[in-house]
């Protein structure tokens, strides 16, 4: 779908305060294949050479409420024998993502937009570049 | 900040479709510092041991409308002297994300939310769980 | 309609573990994490812990730590809740709980209808 | 860990009567939620977020209170609400019941 044109009873593009004032239906779509979801492994944290745990945020003012986030368990990433090795490092995948926060003293049901900064999982890097030959 | 009580000018949170019509306002907030998002290492893509290339997915009628998604470059990790390891597979790490899509035939400014899928980076992960000692 | 089924009674001994199942139907799974509760006879509501199946997330009540183990399988739509070490205060009925991940004022919403675990020797 | 004491334990009232049942939290908590639980019976959601009434629970049921001090109050009795009612927090970790209250119908 493209964007309609404007019409007299939508909010004008141009107006100064149009991104102020949009109306959101809150009723998550899923919009993934339950197979999708559930083909989608949750056991990487454990099996990962830089394996991570997940601790639970929750602020009942954002939308969403609860968000798992990642935090790299050991500095150095593990090896073939399970002893860490001191040549790599675990390190954060981050992504910055969108939430929903209540506006201060105001109804419950009226957000503003925020960036938010999540850790993901972790990744195991070498302090040099190297490409697979 | 809690939840007000409900007034008579603020939907009732029981109310059936309470969360179908709540405002929101889009003039995203950074509540990141600078310092924060300038520390976040962009390279972890090349110097992985599961190395990964970002492409970009656009879509107008969705907020936010760019999103770079992950892609694993190989389907092997890349060892210490970078070739790639037949015994470890590098796997994409995803999140699930809130997106605002466009409501379809409606106004420009009136969004629902949607639920993506999104590749954030690779890992490197071994068959069996290792712990480290 | 919303469903959480959990499975039949249990009498273990001593020392064993017990694993507990819930299945879920009705709703997206992964769109609630599911808690467990126990109350033993006669008593109140203890909060064990909580599982996303999700992102696969787990948070025990320190109580609990090391003894309980929460997992999901996102397949089957089934949560897992199991204790070791067992001892008879861990009598009790063993309760999952949805728990809605995007809106969390709602709490609570829909509990199984319980396990029995008995410890006895 | 936060702990919440509901006041009376148990309670003993006829039909139609008002009821109130308090919980207090020995720090201050966002929200308080209450359980309905009858004897071999599931506990049920009955109010959440404080004021709210989940759905079904008859309206002569409100809850009210903030910081430490909260209440369920029941208008006027009806012998369908003996049961035992539970305040929960899930404000700070470990999320804790109170004790419960007995309601008894004379």
């Known amino acids: 779908a493209v964007l309609i044109p404007q019409s007299s009873v939508c909010p004008n593009a141009e107006a100064n305060n149009f991104l102020q004032n949009v109306k959101v239906n809150l009723k998550v779509i899923n919009s993934l294949s339950s197979k999708a979801s559930s083909r989608r492994p949750s056991d990487y944290l454990n099996r990962s050479t830089s394996p991570w745990t997940l601790s639970r945020n929750e602020d009942p003012d954002r939308y969403p409420s609860v968000i798992w986030e990642a935090q790299c368990r050991h500095q150095r990433c593990v090896n073939a024998e399970g002893k860490l090795d001191h040549h790599m490092n675990s390190v954060l995948i981050q992504q910055e993502i969108l939430v929903l926060k209540r506006e201060p003293e105001k109804c419950p049901f009226t957000f503003r937009v925020e960036k938010m900064l999540v850790g993901v999982g972790c990744t195991c890097v070498s302090s040099i570049v190297r490409h697979a030959s | 900040a809690v939840l007000i009580p409900q007034s008579s000018v603020c939907p009732n949170a029981e109310a059936n479709n309470f969360l179908q019509n709540v405002k929101v306002n889009l003039k995203v907030i950074n509540s990141l510092s600078s310092k924060a998002s300038s520390r976040r290492p962009s390279d972890y893509l090349n110097r992985s041991t599961s190395p990964w290339t970002l492409s970009r997915n656009e879509d107008p009628d969705r907020y936010p409308s760019v999103i770079w998604e992950a892609q694993c470059r190989h389907q092997r990790c890349v060892n210490a002297e970078g070739k790639l390891d037949h015994h470890m597979n590098s796997v994409l790490i995803q999140q699930e994300i809130l997106v605002l899509k466009r409501e379809p035939e409606k106004c420009p400014f009136t969004f629902r939310v949607e639920k993506m899928l999104v590749g954030v980076g690779c890992t490197c992960v071994s068959s069996i769980v290792r712990h480290a000692s | 309609e919303v469903q959480l089924v959990q499975s039949g009674a249990e009498v273990k001994k001593p020392g064993s573990s017990v694993k507990v199942s819930c299945k879920a139907s009705?709703?997206?799974?992964?769109?609630?994490?599911i808690h467990w509760v126990r109350q033993a006879p006669g008593q109140g509501l203890e909060w064990i812990g909580v599982?996303?199946?999700?992102?696969?997330?787990?948070f025990y009540n320190q109580k609990f730590d090391g003894r309980a183990t929460l997992t999901a399988d996102k397949s089957t739509s089934t949560a897992y809740m199991e204790l070791s070490s067992l001892r008879s205060e861990d009598t009790a009925v063993y309760y999952c709980?949805?728990?809605?991940?995007?809106?969390?004022?709602?709490?609570?919403?829909?509990w199984g209808q319980g396990t029995t675990v008995t410890v006895s020797s | 860990e936060i702990v919440l004491t509901q006041s009376p334990d148990f309670q003993s009232v006829t039909p139609k009567e008002k009821v109130t049942i308090t919980c207090s939290a020995s720090?201050?908590?966002?929200?308080i939620y209450w359980f309905q639980q009858k004897p071999d019976q599931s506990p049920k959601r009955w109010i959440y977020?404080?004021?709210e009434l989940a759905s079904g629970v008859p309206s002569r049921f409100s809850g009210s209170g903030s910081g430490t001090d909260y209440t369920l109050t029941i208008n006027s009795l009806e012998a369908e609400d003996a049961a035992t009612y539970y305040c929960?927090?899930?404000?700070?970790?470990?999320?804790?019941f109170g004790q419960g209250t007995k309601l008894e119908i004379k």
């Open positions: 709980t949805r728990y809605y991940r995007y809106e969390s004022f709602y709490g609570m919403d829909y």
């Open positions: 009705g709703y997206t799974f992964t769109d609630y994490e």
């Open positions: 720090s201050s908590i966002s929200y």
């Open positions: 929960h927090q899930r404000s700070s970790y470990p999320w804790t």
């Open positions: 599982n996303d199946p999700e992102s696969g997330g787990t």
């Open positions: 977020a404080t004021f």
